[in-house]
Interface confidence: low
């Protein structure tokens, strides 16, 4: 099977795991470790970029520790001896929660993204081209380890969402109610969590995330389409996602997808060519049964602006368009925190996204 010149991924590997990095580390190589932190056993896990399988020569030891409030240790081991630790006293992982951990190898450093956000830079202490092995151990389950060759272009590069010159920090949202569209559903107070308003710079493809205190609209250039972003922490009951935009005058279709790994947990697909709003779920690249019923006429109109509010509840998603409840969609994928990616595409211009 074709992997566009990249090494085939390791699929569902058992932990502890050690595997060869074909051709070793190269400038521009991106390695993604996707898995879930175990909630029960252990307080640490580690990802190591090393020479051989002995563990005596580790160019980059990335070691989250759920101890003392949580922190991440980065270090290098040469000839069995550890160097000085670099500690980051912020813990981007949660026990029992899935994660997407990306390592970008660059000439001066490793850049590490956790769930789409730049987390740390680790400057090389030893030549990275010596590395030929990746190992993972500790309190973690792995879904896959994949490799993106620097000579290939992924559909949506994992590192496109945050320019590395702009580390992003997310202060906790201040207490109090979020603004909600006018009286559609009962206002459940949301747990204290991060709300992200996505804005764009004028340079195409250079997106970055900013904290929202409180949610508000920003005037800015049109979003690049398709627009893909991480939903921090995934879905949970009371989680809201807000989008607004304008339907193109000649629009045929557009879609809003809430994705869980390689599956589309919720596909919202207004179709002007069919005068329908289609909802569905895609698992293993295959669609389920469509839901199309609406309590009123098609709410989206060519050439007109719209707002969509998706409210996650325990058993379903409630969707309101232009402040009016439109339908409920009962969860077919029920592990809500894994639904952690928003994708928007098609014949619209986005003006505002809040996750």
């Amino acid at each position: 099977m074709a992997f566009s010149g990249s090494q085939a991924p390791y699929l569902s590997p058992a932990v502890p795991f050690s595997g060869t990095i074909q051709g070793g580390l190269q400038d521009g190589l991106q390695i993604t470790v996707n898995g879930t932190v175990l909630s029960s056993s252990g307080t640490r896990f580690a990802v190591n970029f090393q020479t051989g399988f002995s563990g005596n020569d580790i160019a980059f030891h990335f070691n989250p520790r759920f101890e003392d409030g949580g922190y991440v240790v980065c270090n290098t081991r040469q000839n069995g001896s550890w160097g000085p630790e670099e500690r980051k006293t912020h813990m981007p992982f949660q026990k029992g929660m899935p994660f997407d951990l990306c390592f970008l190898v660059q000439s001066s450093d490793f850049k590490v993204m956790v769930n789409g956000i730049l987390f740390v830079q680790y400057f090389h202490r030893v030549p990275f081209h010596r590395v030929d092995t990746i190992s993972v151990n500790g309190s973690v389950q792995l879904s896959y380890i994949s490799f993106q060759n620097p000579r290939t272009v992924p559909v949506q590069p994992a590192f496109s969402t945050v320019p590395f010159s702009q580390p992003v920090c997310f202060p906790p949202r201040p207490r109090g109610r979020r603004q909600k569209p006018p009286g559609v559903w009962p206002a459940n107070p949301a747990p204290i969590t991060q709300t992200v308003i996505h804005t764009v710079q004028s340079a195409p493809g250079q997106m970055f995330s900013t904290p929202a205190i409180p949610p508000m609209m920003y005037p800015h250039p049109a979003y690049p389409m398709p627009f893909i972003t991480t939903i921090l922490g995934g879905l949970y009951p009371s989680k809201s996602i807000l989008l607004s935009g304008t339907v193109l005058p000649s629009a045929q279709r557009f879609h809003i997808n809430l994705c869980s790994g390689n599956h589309i947990a919720f596909h919202l697909n207004p179709r002007f060519d069919e005068n329908a709003v289609v909802r569905n779920t895609q698992i293993d690249n295959s669609w389920g049964s469509e839901e199309r019923s609406l309590p009123r006429k098609m709410p989206f109109v060519r050439g007109q602006s719209f707002s969509v509010w998706i409210l996650c509840e325990a058993h379903c998603l409630k969707v309101a368009v232009d402040g009016q409840h439109l339908f409920e969609y009962y969860h077919r994928l029920r592990n809500l925190p894994t639904i952690n990616r928003l994708e928007v595409g098609g014949d619209i211009q986005l003006t505002h996204v809040q996750t």
Epitope: M1, S12, V15, S146, S286, R332, R334
Partner: antibody, heavy 128, light 108 residues
Amino acid sequence: EVQLVESGGGLVQPGGSLRLSCAASGFTVYSSSIHWVRQAPGKGLEWVASIYPYYGYTSYADSVKGRFTISADTSKNTAYLQMNSLRAEDTAVYYCARKIFWPVSWMWQGYYPALDYWGQGTLVTVSS
Amino acid sequence: DIQMTQSPSSLSASVGDRVTITCRASQSVSSAVAWYQQKPGKAPKLLIYSASSLYSGVPSRFSGSRSGTDFTLTISSLQPEDFATYYCQQSYFPSLVTFGQGTKVEIK
């Protein structure tokens, strides 16, 4: 090495219950999906049920819906098939099989995963 | 439900023959079709996935193709170890997984 080992089969009377186990090694059940497929004596393969533990998703063939329950204990790396209200037509060899969890990029490349590892099967006989 | 109609149900062939088995889906299943080989008393083994992708370790004499809702498994030169029963399977949605009836390949 990836391995799946079924157990729990045997002789049971109509209306009775059995619980089949599928112990996995060499990969994590949590980040794969596990499927039960059965084969009646001299007949073809029939899909029975699936579970995607990572996604909290289960599905069943119409012929067993409401009678069989698929589950997984990820701490034991084991999947189960609880079979209630058994009928003579449930007599078969029951196989568990895994379908891999796969990188998002495969979706863009149009790949559909398949059942790449199977257990040796366990025989369930429903007879009075 | 999606039906997978497999033909022939059995065939006789000699070592070195080219063998073709077909499966027709009752509706579109994209390329979500796999082919398996099963020998008596053994579990099935995966040969082809995504209609035409050869599974690792499977000899290159096996190939798969798709034309609309028609799927074909071809063995270019039948070997003694290839005498077995072959099944197609579609997994277009996990709640609609179905197998073909099977094709038994026997020695002529």
